[in-house]
C-alpha cells in the first residue's frame, strides 16, 4: 500500500451545459492512496464553500488506489462574472497542496 499522490485535472463546463443556464466545473483526482483528500475551490482567488459536491470511487482492485471528482456548480450568470477557476488539492502524498486552474474563455 504505497502512498500515491493524485493526478489532478480541472475541466470547465461544456458549451452545451452553459446553454442550459448552469455551469459545472469539475476537479478530478486520479489514482491516489490513501483515500483521504481535500478539494478546495477558488474563484478569482475567493474560497468557495457549500456549492460543491464530491464523489469517490471504490478502491481499484488492481492497484488499490482511489479516484475522486469534485463538482462546483454555479449558474451561468455567476460563472460568467468571474475569470479564474481553481481547485486546490491536499493529500498525504503531496508535500504541499497542488492547484489546477483555468481562465474562463481561454480554454
Amino acid at each position: 500500500r504505497t502512498v500515491a499522490a493524485p493526478s489532478v485535472f480541472i475541466f470547465p463546463p461544456s458549451d452545451e451545459q452553459l446553454k442550459s443556464g448552469t455551469a459545472s466545473v469539475v476537479c478530478l483526482l486520479n489514482n491516489f492512496y490513501p483515500r483521504e483528500a481535500k478539494v478546495q475551490w477558488k474563484v478569482d482567488n475567493a474560497l468557495q464553500s457549500g456549492n460543491s459536491q464530491e464523489s469517490v470511487t471504490e478502491q481499484d482492485s488492481k492497484d488499490s488506489t482511489y479516484s475522486l471528482s469534485s463538482t462546483l456548480t454555479l449558474s451561468k450568470a455567476d460563472y460568467e462574472k468571474h475569470k479564474v477557476y481553481a481547485c486546490e488539492v491536499t493529500h498525504q502524498g503531496l508535500s504541499s497542496p497542488v492547484t489546477k486552474s483555468f481562465n474562463r474563455g481561454e480554454c
Epitope: 500500500r1 464553500s49 460543491s52 464530491e54 469534485s70 498525504q92
Partner: antibody, heavy 119, light 107 residues
Framework: DVQLQESGPGLVNPSQSLSLTCTVT?????????WNWIRQFPGNKLEWMGY???????SYNPSLKSRISITRDTSKNQFFLQLNSVATEDTATYYC????????????WGAGTTVTVSS | DIQMTQSPASLSASVGETVTITCRAS??????LTWYLQKQGKSPQLLVN???TLAEGVPSRFSGSGSGSQFSLKINSLQPEDFGTYYC?????????FGGGTKLEIK
Amino acid sequence: DVQLQESGPGLVNPSQSLSLTCTVTGYSITGDYAWNWIRQFPGNKLEWMGYISYSGLTSYNPSLKSRISITRDTSKNQFFLQLNSVATEDTATYYCTSFYYGYWYFDVWGAGTTVTVSS
Amino acid sequence: DIQMTQSPASLSASVGETVTITCRASENIYSFLTWYLQKQGKSPQLLVNNAKTLAEGVPSRFSGSGSGSQFSLKINSLQPEDFGTYYCQHHYGTPYTFGGGTKLEIK
C-alpha cells in the same frame, strides 16, 4: 477553537440501535475537517469506527461496516453515530474527534460518553 | 488492517527518570504516526504527530522518532503529570488503528 460534545443514552438494550450525537462548536462541520467516532472498550483498547468528511463523504471501519452509519445535520452543526444490532461487546466510552485535512491526526476530542449495553 | 504493537504494556518509573516506549507497525506507514497520552478519566491528548513533531504546548522533554514501521517515544526527566497511558496510532489510510497502550506508573 473547535470543541466537541457527545450526547446520547447511557444504556441500550441488546439487539437495539445505539444513537449518539456530537455537537461541534467553534467551527463549521463543512470546513476542512473529517468528523470521527472512536470508542474505548473497558479494557482500554481504542477502536476507530468511522468518519464523515467536510463534504459528507463517509468511511467506516470494515469490522463495523454492516452495522454503522454516520450522518450529519449541517444546520445544527452536529454529526451522528448509529450502531445497529448492539451486543454487550459494544459497551464502551464513545468519543467524537476530528482531524484536519493536511494534518490527518486526531487533534480535538470530546470528553466521551459511556454507553452500556445491557438488558 | 495495519496492526500497531506497543511495548512495554506497562512501565514503572520514578520522577526524574528517562523512559522510552516503542511502537511497531505491521507494514510501512512512512511517518504517519501519532502519540497520545490519556490520563485517568480523560480523553486522549495529542503529544506527537508525524512521528516526531511535538504538538503545541507539549514540553521538550518529549521526543518522537522513527519512520517506516519502527517508532519510539522518549520522555526525559519524567514529571508527575507525565504518568498515564500512552497510545500510538497510525494515520495512513483507514481503518486507523491504535497500539494497545503503555501504562506508565509512578514507582
